[in-house]
């Protein structure tokens, strides 16, 4: 289930240009903005998706408290540099030669500097906390039903193995989905938790990245689960390095 042969499209990434010019006349798809060939049987990396997005025309608590090293993507969109495999390069710079280091999901993890800034390695984000608030419902969702549906969603829609969904917490109206994936746990072919989280984030905003597949229709025992806000926290294997100035 790579690129769909019949009409030569990429089921997992609508931000591609596809043509039957692959080996043996097979459908091959390339990401907009970068021209990198993508595997349409799995999720496209967040780096290539952000690059494509920038190239497109403009138009009693059971809940987890993120620790002090948790990062939130406050910087918004930027046009990233991706390596040949589609991963974020550790150092990102803008057109005015301002540079910063990012983690594996492309979120800034240092203060901004100049072209002399060094980012020795791409630090892996190994724990992602997706914090959702759902619209009011007549009654709270059953926690175990909600847990089951969200795990199934991540497996079937985003192809993320259930072992990487560490927990689903619920305290009406807040839902928290914890994704965990250490470097040692991630095998070849496994979807990255960062990519799954990004696809999910776009889905809940009504901006599905899937081609031809319907938008996200999440139901728990037939009751629609409608998300009204999303906040995503990222925890890296090595804590971020910000100056005290930013923390005050």
């Amino acid at each position: 289930h790579t690129a769909a042969q019949d009409n030569c499209t990429c089921p997992t990434n609508k931000m591609t240009v596809c043509s039957p010019d692959g080996p043996g006349g097979r459908c091959q798809c390339r990401a907009l903005g970068s021209g990198v060939a993508v595997d349409c049987s799995t999720l496209t990396s967040k780096c290539l998706l952000l690059k494509a997005r920038m190239s497109a025309p403009k138009n009693a608590r059971t809940l987890v408290r993120p620790n002090e090293h948790a990062l939130v993507d406050n910087d918004g969109l930027y046009d990233p540099d991706c390596d040949p495999e589609g991963r974020f390069k550790a150092r990102q710079c803008n057109q005015t030669s301002v540079c910063w280091c990012v983690n594996s999901v492309g979120v800034r993890r240092t203060d901004k500097g100049d072209l002399s800034l060094r980012c020795d390695e791409l630090v892996r984000t190994h724990h992602i906390l997706i914090d959702l608030r759902h619209r009011p419902t007549a009654s709270a969702f059953n926690h175990s039903d909600l847990d089951a549906e969200l795990r199934r969603l991540f497996r079937e829609r985003y192809r993320l193995h259930p072992k990487f969904v560490a927990a689903v917490h619920y305290e009406q109206p807040t839902i928290q989905i914890e994704l965990r994936q250490n470097t040692s746990q991630k095998a070849a072919g496994d979807v990255d938790i960062g990519d799954a989280a990004y696809y999910f984030e776009r889905d809940v905003k009504g901006e599905s990245l899937f081609q031809g597949r319907g938008g996200l229709d999440l139901r728990v025992r037939g009751e629609p689960l409608q998300v009204e806000r999303t906040l995503i926290y990222y925890l890296d294997e090595i804590p971020p390095k910000f100056s005290m100035k930013r923390l005050t």
Partner: antibody
Framework: QSLEESGGDLVQPGASLTLTCKAS????????MLWVRQAPGKGLEWIGC???????TYFASWATGRFAISKTSSTTVTLQMTSLTAADTATYFC?????????????WGPGTLVTVSS | YDMTQTPASVSAAVGGTVTIKCQAS??????LAWYQQKPGQPPKLLIY???DLASGVPSRFKGSGSGTEYTLTISALECDDAATYYC????????????FGGGTEVVVK
């Protein structure tokens, strides 16, 4: 790597029965385990599934309520069945997915026969 | 996601070819498997992802299709191919009655 079902029996209508699936040679936590049944001379019928990591269970619409699946030890999964009728007479198989995120069943037990009759 | 398999039974001579079709009620994105089952045995995975051969399966077995329409073709039939074949959608287990097609009995003359 192998699976083996046990617990099949001749039971009366209305009875309950628990089947056990014993796994050998692999770590259950990396897989989903599914139960499938086959009535004599009929086709395969999916009953339900458990994601071992997380323990969440899923059932065919006709099986919801009367069937339950659980992981009972590091190597065993059970299928509990209640209010059995003659229509539940079948060979019951447990099967393992291939460790991907699809539900391809690449390892099956030999099956255990359940007969519901008065 | 109902799976409709045709025909229910097919007969062909040794060395011949049989074709089995499977139709899904909705797009299953090529997440389709084919199984072979012989009497008294559990099913055996033959093909996954609509066209990829499982380990040890001879290349006489060929799967094809996409969207909602899928086909299993067995060429150069051998006596040992006499069995019942089932398709299975491996895309979702949400709100469904069955993941399997009804089965096709292959008789080799």
């Amino acid at each position: 790597q192998s699976l083996e079902e046990s617990g099949g029996d001749l039971v009366q209508p209305g009875a309950s029965l628990t089947l056990t699936c014993k796994a050998s040679g692999f770590d259950l936590n990396n897989y989903a385990m599914l139960w499938v049944r086959q009535a004599p001379g009929k086709g395969l019928e999916w009953i339900g599934c458990i994601y071992i990591s997380g323990g969440t269970t899923y059932f065919a619409s006709w099986a919801t309520g009367r069937f339950a699946i659980s992981k009972t030890s590091s190597t065993t999964v059970t299928l509990q069945m209640t209010s059995l009728t003659a229509a539940d007479t079948a060979t019951y198989f447990c099967a393992r997915d291939d460790g991907s995120t699809s539900y391809y069943l690449n390892l099956w037990g030999p099956g255990t026969l359940v007969t519901v009759s008065s | 996601y109902d799976m409709t398999q045709t025909p229910a039974s097919v007969s062909a001579a040794v060395g011949g070819t049989v074709t089995i079709k499977c139709q899904a009620s909705e797009d299953i994105y090529s997440l389709l498997a084919w199984y072979q089952q012989k009497p008294g045995q559990p099913p055996k995975l033959l093909i996954y992802d609509a066209s990829d051969l499982a380990s040890g399966v001879p290349s006489r077995f060929k799967g094809s299709g996409s969207g909602t329409e899928y086909t299993l073709t067995i060429s150069a039939l051998e006596c040992d191919d006499a069995a019942t074949y089932y398709c299975q959608q491996a895309y979702t287990i949400g709100n469904i009655d069955n993941t399997f097609g009804g089965g096709t009995e292959v008789v080799v003359k």
